[in-house]
């Protein structure tokens, strides 16, 4: 929801968390502001305190329940409001009717591990975290490998167009240190975006056997 120079963006992690960022040019840093969540068809509501993340933007996480509980469904609509204290009263700064499953950003994949490593290849697996059972297998992944002397931004993206929680990296250099990251995105949702990248997994390929043609 955009109002003049105000921007209010939220994402649902598909289970029990809505993360919001509100930015407003010229807003006072010391103003106390909150995000209020009012689902249209639930008995609960939730509030979180917006905390500054930069000169003109604030963020907070609406914790709706235990991490793996399914707190919202595909038909819920949540009214989200930014409320800021002005003296003794609260003023509404931004509002949006939020469709959780149109605005998804999952948690970063976790539990990355090397399943098997050789001189030229490495098999890596991971797990998705706090992802709704709604998605069945309809998720996609992007992965990238950091090679020596390069940056993450230079790393080519590998796309996995299905729910495949492993990858076999090929054509690696023997006895070389690499890092690997992966992120996930559901197919569902007009404004859905990629999860954050996972924590990098460091691994080293095996050295080539002496006297062998590699």
């Amino acid at each position: 929801a955009v109002n003049g120079t105000s921007r209010f963006t939220c994402f649902y992690n598909s289970r029990a968390n809505i993360s919001c960022v509100w930015s407003q040019d010229g807003a006072l840093q010391d103003t106390s502001c909150q995000v209020h969540a009012w689902p249209d068809r639930r008995r609960w509501n939730q509030t979180c305190e917006l905390l500054p993340v930069s000169q003109a933007s604030w963020a907070c996480n609406l914790i709706l329940g235990t991490p793996d509980s399914q707190k919202l469904t595909a038909v819920d609509i949540v009214t989200l409001r930014v409320m800021c204290r002005e003296g003794v009263r609260w003023r509404m700064m931004a509002i949006q009717d939020f469709k959780p499953f149109e605005n998804l950003r999952l948690m970063a994949p976790i539990s990355l591990q090397v399943v098997h490593v050789e001189t030229h290849r490495c098999n890596i697996s991971w797990k998705i975290s706090q992802a709704s059972h709604y998605f069945e297998r309809h998720l996609e992944f992007e992965a990238r490998t950091l090679s020596p002397g390069h940056t993450w931004e230079e790393a080519p993206l590998m796309t996995l167009k299905q729910k495949q929680e492993w990858i076999c990296l090929e054509t690696l250099t023997p006895d070389t240190q690499y890092e690997f990251q992966v992120r996930v995105k559901p197919l569902q949702g007009e404004f859905t975006t990629w999860s954050p990248w996972s924590q990098p997994l460091a691994f080293r390929t095996k050295p080539a056997a002496l006297g062998k043609d590699t």
């Epitope: 399914q70 469904t73 595909a74 038909v75 059972h133 709604y134 069945e136 197919l187 569902q188 007009e190």
Partner: antibody, heavy 117, light 107 residues
């Protein structure tokens, strides 16, 4: 292999209630959604509702809300759809289907319900 | 509720030719549109999700596209087993609704 096997054809009188079962196998029933869809002759497909076995919640289409009840028995991996106050226009094939909320990935074979006096 | 209108109601095409089926939503539904195939005496089968994503196991000759509120299912080279009824379904606004179907018959 994913399978949904429905109970057999039913003949009912107007005003009666019908209860159809849908026995599933090949996937984790406790983490699934089971939908029910009506296909009346010459009327196309109508989505009736779902049960979310993990969240323990049901969702019904407004057109069926007053007369339909969807339940599940997780001990037998079976979903049920009960339709009450039957009328002649409820004569149809009823399907159960597995899916996320948004679309129906696997379907049962269908159960024909005939409402006739 | 959103009304899904499919056209034509019946489409006659020769085997080996291309078939184009249309589905129009009465309001904007983003890409929340799914296609099913139903053969006589059988349950529907999911073909395409979110307007253009093929389901695994579905032949590559089936493809989907979108232009605004109009969605198209294209079968590039019709096989005998493709003659059936095709339904679209929206999942943007509750309750989910289906089109009335397009019957694809042999010319």
């Amino acid at each position: 292999e994913v399978q949904l096997v429905q109970s057999g054809a039913e003949v009912k009188k107007p005003g009666a209630t019908v209860k159809i079962s849908c026995k599933v196998s090949g996937f984790n029933f406790k983490e699934s959604l089971i939908h029910w869809v009506q296909q009346a002759p010459g009327k196309g497909l109508e989505w009736m509702g779902w049960i979310d076995n993990e969240a323990g919640e049901t969702e019904y289409a407004p057109g069926f809300q007053d007369r339909v009840t969807i339940t599940a028995d997780t001990s037998t991996d079976t979903a049920y759809m009960e339709l009450s106050s039957l009328r002649s226009e409820d004569t149809a094939v009823y399907y159960c289907a597995r899916g996320g909320p948004w679309f129906l990935s696997y379907w049962g074979q269908g159960t024909t319900v005939t409402v006739s006096s | 509720e959103i009304v899904m209108t499919q056209s034509p109601a019946t489409l006659s095409v020769s085997p080996g030719e291309r078939a184009t089926l249309s589905c129009r939503a009465s309001q904007i539904i983003s890409n929340n549109l799914h296609w099913y195939q139903q053969k006589p005496g059988q349950a529907p089968r999911l073909l395409i999700i979110y307007g253009l994503q093929s389901i695994s196991g579905i032949p590559a000759r089936f493809s989907g596209s979108r232009s605004g509120t109009e969605f198209t299912l294209t079968i590039s080279s019709l096989q005998s087993e493709d003659f059936a009824v095709y339904f679209c379904q929206q999942s943007n606004n509750f309750p989910w609704t289906f089109g009335q179907g397009t019957k694809l018959e042999i010319k």
